[in-house]
């Protein structure tokens, strides 16, 4: 059985302040069953950036239609980027459980923020 892969194709993305940033992530399989979540940073202090089930993330939207069947694209778009958004973003697959268990993380995409052109 092939092992699930979480693919973040870009190592880094540079965006001008005020613009939107697209962070790409795809998975190689629909199973194991369980959600995808996005975080900024790694380790216990990481910040949850997007999880469809819980929380309110007004600046974050999925790139693909959330109602699309059997879709393996979990890319997100973050609007109105500010310098405070800089950091490394990880797309993380969880195995469903009580609680869900982290299964595999993408390699991360570093977001850098350029000054807004005057």
């Amino acid at each position: 059985e092939e092992e699930l892969q979480v693919i973040q194709p870009e190592k880094s993305v540079s965006v001008a302040a005020g613009d939107s940033a697209t962070l790409n992530c795809t998975v190689s399989s629909l199973i194991p069953v369980g959600p995808i979540q996005w975080f900024r940073g790694a380790g216990p202090g990481r910040e949850l950036i997007y999880n469809l089930k819980e929380g309110h993330f007004p600046r974050v939207t999925p790139v693909s239609d959330p109602t699309k069947r059997n879709n393996m694209d979990f890319s997100i778009r973050i609007s109105n980027i500010t310098p405070a958004d800089a950091g490394t973003y990880y797309c993380v697959k969880f195995r469903k459980g009580s609680p869900d268990v982290e299964l595999k993380s993408g390699a991360g995409t570093e977001l850098s923020v350029r000054a807004k052109p005057s």
């Epitope: 059985e1 699930l4 399989s29 629909l30 199973i31 194991p32 069953v33 369980g34 959600p35 995808i36 469809l52 089930k53 999925p62 693909s64 959330p66 109602t67 699309k68 069947r69 059997n70 879709n71 393996m72 694209d73 979990f74 195995r95 469903k96």
Partner: antibody
Framework: EVQLLESGGGVVQPGGSLRLSCAAS????????VTWVRQAPGKGLEWVST??????YYADSVKGRFTISRDNSKNTLYLQMNSLRAEDTAVYYC???????????????WGQGTLVTVSS | EIVLTQSPATLSVSPGERATFSCRAS??????LAWYQQRPGQAPRLLIY???IRETGIPERFSGSGSGTEFTLTITSLQSEDFAVYYC??????????FGGGTKVEIK
């Protein structure tokens, strides 16, 4: 065309065992979670168990008695049922899971079911 | 466990008429709700998922609506093949997946 064909049902005494099979065709079986749902005579639908790859999930009513498994090389889903009770009497359906990307699973194809009767 | 309550349990409708029935969830399930049709002696068939999206091949007379805790399935102009039992299912929070108790649509 997606097809799911259950087999292995029958009459068994309380405390007995039975193994159900579900032969799948028409889709990439190994790429999808698959599920057993049952329906007692004249009653509604009750989820029994789901398997992904190595991950398995059970209803409380069958936990510890039933075991779900799959053989991707044979495109077949199984349900091993032990310590059967009268209340396990039902038509057992296998179903293919379909996933809405950011969300959960529902069941887009169903077999015709196999009847399990637990009676002395 | 999320409990789904369907009402009415039985609906008597004349062919050609409109049928509307509901599914209420005991807690918010957002749009993670599916509807199935089960004709006598047959397996269930997926009609609607994500509360409102018709499965491929399902006639336009079937429509789903609602979100959160209140959902509705509407069948406009009932055909003879639509007389069946209809079940809702939530997939927001599982295990367990849960189904409603069903609504039987019978000929008036």
């Amino acid at each position: 065309e997606v097809q799911l064909l259950e087999s292995g049902g029958g009459v068994v005494q309380p405390g007995g065992s039975l193994r159900l099979s579900c032969a799948a065709s028409g889709f990439s079986f190994s790429n999808f979670a698959v599920t057993w749902v049952r329906q007692a005579p004249g009653k509604g639908l009750e989820w029994v168990s789901t398997i992904g790859s190595g991950d398995t999930y059970y209803a409380d009513s069958v936990k510890g008695r039933f075991t779900i498994s799959r053989d991707n090389s044979k495109n077949t889903l199984y349900l091993q049922m032990n310590s059967l009770r009268a209340e396990d009497t039902a038509v057992y359906y296998c179903a293919k899971d379909s996933t809405v990307s950011w969300s959960g699973d529902f069941f887009d194809y169903w077999g015709q079911g196999t009847l399990v009767t637990v009676s002395s | 466990e999320i409990v789904l309550t369907q009402s009415p349990a039985t609906l008597s409708v004349s062919p050609g008429e409109r049928a509307t029935f509901s599914c209420r969830a005991s807690q918010n399930v957002k749009n993670d709700l599916a509807w199935y049709q089960q004709r006598p002696g047959q397996a269930p068939r997926l009609l609607i998922y994500a509360a409102r999206i018709r499965e491929t091949g399902i006639p336009e007379r079937f429509s789903g609506s609602g979100s959160g805790t209140e959902f509705t399935l509407t069948i406009t102009s009932l055909q003879s093949e639509d007389f069946a039992v209809y079940y809702c299912q939530q997939y927001y929070d599982w295990p367990p997946f849960t189904f409603g108790g069903g609504t039987k649509v019978e000929i008036k």
